[in-house]
Amino acid sequence: CDLPQTHSLGSRRTLMLLAQMRRISLFSCLKDRHDFGFPQEEFGNQFQKAETIPVLHEMIQQIFNLFSTKDSSAAWDETLLDKFYTELYQQLNDLEACVIQGVGVTETPLMKEDSILAVRKYFQRITLYLKEKKYSPCAWEVVRAEIMRSFSLSTNLQESLRSKE
């Protein structure tokens, strides 16, 4: 399955929207930095496309879930958030279309299941951090910066998969 060129454009737009969502000076948030333990190894180049697409799908689904909460709506600009949802939704559709076309339809490798679980646990740590920080503006900025970094890393994987073909 070939992800459309619009998919990588959508990824760039997503990052741009995340950058625009910033609401306060980040310099006041330095002490709120946190190690969320992004499972970078789950996005390594050792994966075949069939194994990668469900992991990328999980990543984007979890980002969607994180920013769809009531607390998120209170933290960010509504117009930007709506555009952000639209971009994520389109990317989920692109990835789902690939799965339907037969990529990953065969018996799910255990490695892929472990990767999906690692991504879920990563987002659980992010959710717990926000809860512990009482969804403060700085906590949300730290999370936004983290999502920009992890989304960028996973997007780079998509690009490397495309270039290897």
Epitope: L26, L30, D35, F36, M148, S152
Partner: antibody, heavy 121, light 107 residues
Framework: EVQLVQSGAEVKKPGESLKISCKGS????????IGWVRQMPGKGLEWMGI????????AYSPSFQGQVTISADKSISTAYLQWSSLKASDTAMYYC??????????????WGQGTLVTVSS | DIQMTQSPSSLSASVGDRVTITCRAS??????LNWYQQKPGKAPKLLIY???SLQSGVPSRFSGSGSGTDFTLTISSLQPEDFATYYC?????????FGQGTKVEIK
């Protein structure tokens, strides 16, 4: 390969203005902050200030606030440090270094080679 | 501002020695402490970040420990290329601040 390349050494007279530069390459320039550090001859490191090139937000050390201006041009991946009126006490080596911002990653992991500024009448 | 105090300010040691440098913060900085090495005429080089994480490419003889206000940089077996000045720096809050430096000289 990540690189921060600084402009060359400068010799200036007291009262003159100066703008030195730090060009980033090999990484996404707007994803990291750029900090400036001063080292006077035979002395230690002093943090001057920092800029977020994505929107040019800045923070300064109280010791340097109002004495220097930090700016950036993200279109050419370059950060700047400038003086409107140099003093002899500004004679020092000036370094730029990248900072991961709010991400949990190494601070000041890459440094420029330094720009020596000499102010003498 | 958070003050960073290093000790000793200088020390003499021999190749193979175990060297320990300490850094104390004027208030708790959790684990937000970095260690740098600087050689004459060169830019500083990051050795340790977040108190104990070894920067990529740095030899394993360098290690860092501590949290709160008291931190330590240890060189388990000093090598000829380790003779330099070492700085700690807090990255907990602005303004960022450095220690005054510890010069490691040949005995």
């Amino acid at each position: 390969e990540v690189q921060l390349v600084q402009s060359g050494a400068e010799v200036k007279k007291p009262g003159e203005s100066l703008k030195i530069s730090c060009k980033g390459s090999g990484y996404s320039f707007t994803s990291y902050w750029i900090g400036w550090v001063r080292q006077m001859p035979g002395k230690g490191l002093e943090w001057m200030g920092i800029i977020d090139p994505s929107d040019s937000d800045t923070a300064y050390s109280p010791s340097f606030q109002g004495q220097v201006t930090i700016s950036a041009d993200k279109s050419i991946s370059t950060a700047y440090l400038q003086w409107s009126s140099l003093k002899a006490s500004d004679t020092a080596m000036y370094y730029c270094a990248r900072h991961p911002g709010l991400n949990w990653a190494p601070d000041f992991d890459y440094w420029g080679q330094g720009t020596l500024v000499t102010v003498s009448s | 501002d958070i003050q960073m105090t290093q000790s000793p300010s200088s020390l003499s040691a021999s190749v193979g020695d175990r060297v320990t440098i300490t850094c104390r913060a004027s208030q708790s900085i959790d684990g937000s402490l970095n260690w740098y090495q600087q050689k004459p005429g060169k830019a500083p080089k990051l050795l340790i970040y977040f108190a104990s994480s070894l920067q990529s490419g740095v030899p394993s003889r360098f290690s860092g420990s501590g949290s709160g206000t008291d931190f330590t940089l240890t060189i388990s077996s000093l090598q000829p290329e380790d003779f330099a000045t070492y700085y700690c720096q807090q990255s907990y809050d602005f303004p960022l601040t450095f220690g005054q430096g510890t010069k490691v000289e040949i005995k």
